[in-house]
């Protein structure tokens, strides 16, 4: 892209060229021949996070208890209040606007990834030799009891759901 | 006082390139940008383009992208406008003009005209 | 593209008079509206920049008001050297774009 008559940081207007605003500042007037551009920091409730000529602040994001929300990050003059979910919620969008419990996975599926404030659990179904018999948020698919380093054998083959069942050899007379 | 002279009337082929010249005196030409304009009778202005004759840097107007180039000589304070492809359609007076404020100062306009 | 629209394509009056010349934006401009006079011998000047600025060397009968879309050039006492084509042009946004002119007679 060629440049611009204009350089980095600077916008024209009326054929002139007059320098933006800094993050944390808004637009009150444009320079002229004789003026430099005049800015006015945002108030506290407001922010402008780029090199601008807007005349208004944006208001920092709210982060709604009522939809699960929390402050992770204050927001400042220059950055966006930054949202995250309370515990045992997660975002239901990338925006985070409002919030959504973790699923459980169900019995034969193990947790892979457990929730965090942005992103939900992820499932994955117990493998051979692997089992979970609860709906939960947090548990792995466990491995299936071995039998032989109890000395015992199995009397009941395990599924992803259930445990093996062992129980003792028997003893030829 | 400011002073834009251009360079002089040009009748010109289909199909071939021209360059006009636009002379600044009276002022410090790297500080101001320079705007050129297109006037046909009865077509009222168009605006072309602006340059920043410091940094070499170009805005255009969408229509003019692929027909006018503009660039500019610091060492003789002079602002060029190259056209090409050229047709009847740009049979036209064009002007150079100062900025700041505004369109402030213009040049007195050349007359091109494109005729086999 | 921002449209400027000059609705009086020319206008006649008499050595003395007020005349008031208007242009009309497409949309808000800010106050981005200047105002150009070119004489019949194809001279053009800057009268009026920003709405209402009174360029160096402009006599004071040339007075500019306006905001939004809606703008206008006054010229109180006409002399007989007003006789011209009088332009506005946005400056606000790019393309910077013209309005068709308004022709000044003498009646």
């Known amino acids: 892209e060629p440049p611009t008559a204009c350089r980095e940081k600077q916008y024209l207007i009326n054929s002139q060229c007059c320098s933006l605003c800094q993050p944390g500042q808004k637009l009150v007037s444009d320079c002229t021949e004789f003026t430099e551009t005049e800015c006015l920091p945002c108030s506290e409730s407001e922010f402008l996070d780029t090199w601008n000529r807007e005349t208004r602040c944006h208001q920092h994001k709210y982060c709604d208890p009522n939809l699960g929300l929390r402050v992770q990050q204050k927001g400042t003059s220059e950055t966006d209040t930054i949202c995250t979910c309370e515990e045992g919620l997660h975002c239901m969008s990338e925006s985070c606007e409002s919030c959504v419990p973790h699923r459980s996975c169900l019995p034969g599926f193990g947790v892979k990834q457990i929730a965090t404030g942005v992103s939900d659990t992820i499932c994955e179904p117990c493998p051979v030799g692997f089992f979970s018999n609860v709906s939960s948020a947090f548990e792995k698919c466990r491995p299936w009891t071995s039998c032989e380093t109890k000395d015992l054998v199995v009397q009941q083959a395990g599924t992803n759901k259930t445990d093996v069942v062992c129980g003792p050899q028997d003893r030829q007379r | 006082q400011v002073r834009l002279q251009q360079s002089g009337a040009e009748l010109v082929r289909p199909g071939t390139s021209m360059r006009v010249s636009c002379k600044a005196s009276?002022?410090?030409?790297?500080?101001?940008?320079i705007n050129w304009v297109k006037q046909r009778p009865g077509q009222g202005l168009e605006w072309i383009g602006i340059?920043?004759?410091?940094?070499?840097?170009?805005n255009y107007n969408e229509n003019f992208k692929d027909k006018a180039t503009l660039t500019a000589d610091k060492s003789s304070n002079t602002a060029y406008m190259q056209l090409s492809s050229l047709t009847s359609e740009d049979s036209a007076v064009y002007f150079c003009?100062?900025?700041?404020?505004?369109?402030?100062?213009w040049g007195q306009g050349t007359l091109v005209t494109v005729s086999a | 593209d921002i449209q400027m629209t000059q609705t009086t394509s020319s206008l006649s009056a008499s050595l003395g008079d007020r005349v008031t010349i208007s242009c009309r934006a497409s949309?808000?401009?800010?106050?981005?509206l200047n105002w150009y006079q070119q004489k019949p011998d194809g001279t053009v000047k800057l009268l009026i920049y920003?709405?209402?600025g009174l360029h160096s060397g402009v006599p004071s009968r040339f007075n500019g008001s306006g905001s939004g879309t809606d703008y206008s050039l006054t010229i109180s006492n006409l002399e007989q050297e007003d006789i011209a084509t009088y332009f506005c042009?946005?400056?606000?946004?790019?393309?910077?774009?013209f309005g068709g002119g308004t022709k000044l007679e003498i009646k």
């Open positions: 042009q946005q400056g606000y946004t790019l393309p910077y774009t």
């Open positions: 340059l920043n004759p410091g940094s070499g840097g170009t």
């Open positions: 003009i100062r900025g700041s404020p505004g369109f402030a100062y």
């Open positions: 949309q808000d401009i800010n106050i981005y």
């Open positions: 920003s709405t209402s």
């Open positions: 009276g002022y410090a030409f790297t500080n101001y940008l």
